[in-house]
């Protein structure tokens, strides 16, 4: 489908003139940031951003690639080098340490420098690195964590935890030796390491004693509490603050976010990760956009500002399954959350960053026709005289042989939300990829986000912009609308 107006050079010249005019007018906001928001698309490499842009555009009855995402409107962009100290291709634990704490670490370790060793409890102490969220709290700001995964998962844990093993969600996931040596599970650290004002996501089962039935799935024993220490961490957290409230469904969340007596809010909406957006029950579970809005309503009450981490965490899971439909619909919801946050905040006093922790071996190619479905077949056939899709993976469970050969694919299959795109190499799980990811920035000091940077630079930009440690002598004018 070719839009007639695009056949005329004037169309492109006019569009470029507008973009050039806007670029010439762009002025850095030189004040300090009152608020910090980091949106983390887990596994959202550039190919995912492009494919999500087309999907979102097509959901709006447009052709696709020309329709900007919310993140596309951010004026400053950089590339982030995502390698960890020990791996060319990182995981979400090492990367979270980099962009949230400002120091690169090792694969599968969280909130620790690279002097710590994976799974070795005794290498924890002395190697802790402090997150920007922790520093924001010390400066009197309200802080929050929002995710579609478990709140104890690697990315959000980078904001509050220090652990040599990202899988130590509750004490039941830890070896006895590590417990005896004094290492703490991530759920325990969530409630005890620092005072977090808003915690929204999944992960109920790690907070309650083993065998405690789940409120949503009381007859499904696999969803019961897992804690061996018999603790009720939710109760412990509630006891710390007069205005604390715990919710586990969408209705309760909406009520709590509008209640002025609620100062601290924990919402855990699934025993583990939250459901994919395409499987979500909208009566029971909030969307990422709704959780983001609820968090912003609470955090915005603090005159000293806030720090908010928002993760679209299941983009990554869709890709690991080689199910691009899941990954891309998660990415579209992630962008919707960015859009909503932009409506609820001002770029004059809020530094907003959007980035990914790492990419995936997800490719988008094969010359599909403009306007055609992102999940469709490529025009023509492959050398084996079989159809193939525009979306593919370098490795993963999408590798299948049928009678010793690559199976043909029909449009009925490729358009299904359950379809696994084909892969070149068979693996149980598709892997992360090592190429640089984008960092989009808007707001005070966003102009510092430029060029090609280490991923750890991101945390330093946030800390500097808000005059947090170690940049308390930042020498920036106070945020717009404030007096100091």
């Amino acid at each position: 489908i070719i839009p007639v107006e695009e056949e005329n050079p004037d169309f492109w010249n006019r569009q470029a003139a507008e973009a050039l005019g806007a670029a010439k007018k762009l002025q850095p906001i030189q004040t300090a940031a009152k608020n910090l928001i980091i949106f983390l698309g887990d596994g959202m490499g550039v190919s995912t951003v492009t494919a999500a842009r087309i999907l979102k555009g097509q959901k709006e009855d447009k052709l696709g690639p020309e329709t900007p995402l919310a993140m596309d409107h951010f004026p400053y962009v950089a590339l982030s080098k995502t390698y960890s100290v020990d791996k060319h291709v990182p995981d979400s634990a090492a990367t979270a340490t980099a962009y949230l704490c400002g120091v690169k670490g090792n694969f599968q370790t969280i909130g620790l420098s690279a002097a710590a060793r994976y799974n070795q409890c005794n290498t924890t102490r002395g190697n802790e690195v402090v997150s920007v969220m922790n520093r924001a709290k010390k400066a009197g700001k309200s802080v929050g964590v929002v995710t579609t995964t478990r709140v104890q998962h690697a990315s959000p844990a980078g904001a509050y935890a220090h652990t040599v093993n990202r899988n130590w969600y509750s004490d039941a996931n830890m070896p006895g030796s590590a417990r005896r040596e004094g290492c703490k599970d991530i759920a325990t650290q969530l409630i005890s390491n620092m005072d977090i004002d808003v915690i929204l996501g999944g992960g109920r089962k790690y907070m309650f004693r083993m065998g405690a039935p789940d409120p949503e799935y009381p007859h499904d024993y696999s969803q019961d509490g897992t804690r061996m220490d018999g603790k009720n961490l939710v109760q412990e957290w509630l006891a710390k603050q007069q205005g604390a409230r715990y919710v586990w469904n969408r209705t309760e969340l909406m009520q709590a976010s509008l209640d002025p007596s609620v100062t601290h809010l924990m919402g855990l909406f699934e025993p583990g990760d939250m459901k994919y957006e395409i499987h979500r029950d909208p009566t029971l579970d909030p969307s990422l956009m709704e959780m983001t809005e609820a968090a912003l309503r609470l955090l915005s009450r603090n005159p000293r500002g806030f720090f908010l981490f928002v993760e679209g965490g299941r983009i990554d899971h869709g890709h690991h399954e080689s199910r691009a439909y899941r990954a891309l619909t998660e990415a579209v919801m992630f962008d919707d959350a960015i859009e909503r946050a932009g409506q609820l905040t001002s770029e004059e006093d809020t530094l907003t960053l959007v980035t990914a922790d790492h990419s995936h071996v997800f490719s988008f190619g094969a010359y599909p026709l403009r306007g055609s479905s992102i999940f469709g077949l490529a025009p023509g056939k492959a050398q084996d005289r079989k159809a193939y899709t525009a979306l593919l993976y370098g490795n993963g469970p999408g590798y299948v042989l049928k009678d010793g050969a690559r199976p043909d694919v029909t449009e009925s299959e490729s358009g299904s939300p359950e379809y696994r795109q084909q892969a070149a190499v068979p693996l149980d799980e598709e892997t992360h990829a090592g190429e640089d990811v984008a960092v989009f920035a808007r707001g005070p000091q966003a102009h510092l986000v430029h060029g090609v940077q280490e991923q750890s630079f991101i945390a330093h930009v946030m800390a500097f912009a808000a005059c947090l440690e170690p940049y308390t002598a930042c020498d920036l004018a106070p945020p717009a609308g404030t007096t100091d």
Partner: nanobody, 126 residues
Framework: QVQLVESGGGLVQAGASLTLSCAAS????????IVWFRQAPGKEREAVSC????????YYGDSVQGRFSSSTDNAKNTVSLQMNSLKPEDTAVYTC???????????????????WGEGTMVTVSS
């Protein structure tokens, strides 16, 4: 193999209702929108309606707006066109088509369709 098969046409009185059905196979509504066209004897082909699952949208031509309504049954992979308050000028061969696009962008242009059904005749007598 993509196939579109229409059914439900026939002869009705002016003011009556009729429902046409388009059974689609070889693709899902996640990858293509479905457009109904009609062609009256001696007249140009006219786009009647478009329905897109991806965009969650439906569009109608000016001449049928408010009288015709399109819906999908995703389980059966069918699209229905409910036609109410039929007029003699609605007499035509009605054909469903699958667009290149998953949404209704450019839906009224026949060249943007990739697959076509055979058509079903609707006659409205006065």
């Amino acid at each position: 193999q993509v196939q579109l098969v229409e059914s439900g046409g026939g002869l009705v009185q002016a003011g009556a209702s009729l429902t046409l059905s388009c059974a689609a196979s070889g693709f899902t509504f996640n990858t293509r929108s479905i457009v109904w066209f009609r062609q009256a004897p001696g007249k140009e082909r006219e786009a009647v309606s478009c329905i897109s699952k991806v965009a969650g949208s439906t569009y109608y031509g000016d001449s049928v707006q408010g009288r015709f309504s399109s819906s999908t049954d995703n389980a059966k992979n069918t699209v229905s066109l409910q036609m109410n308050s039929l007029k003699p000028e609605d007499t035509a061969v009605y054909t469903c088509a699958a667009s290149f696009a998953p949404n209704c962008y450019g839906w009224s242009v026949a060249a943007n369709m990739e697959y076509w059904g055979e058509g079903t005749m609707v006659t409205v007598s006065s």
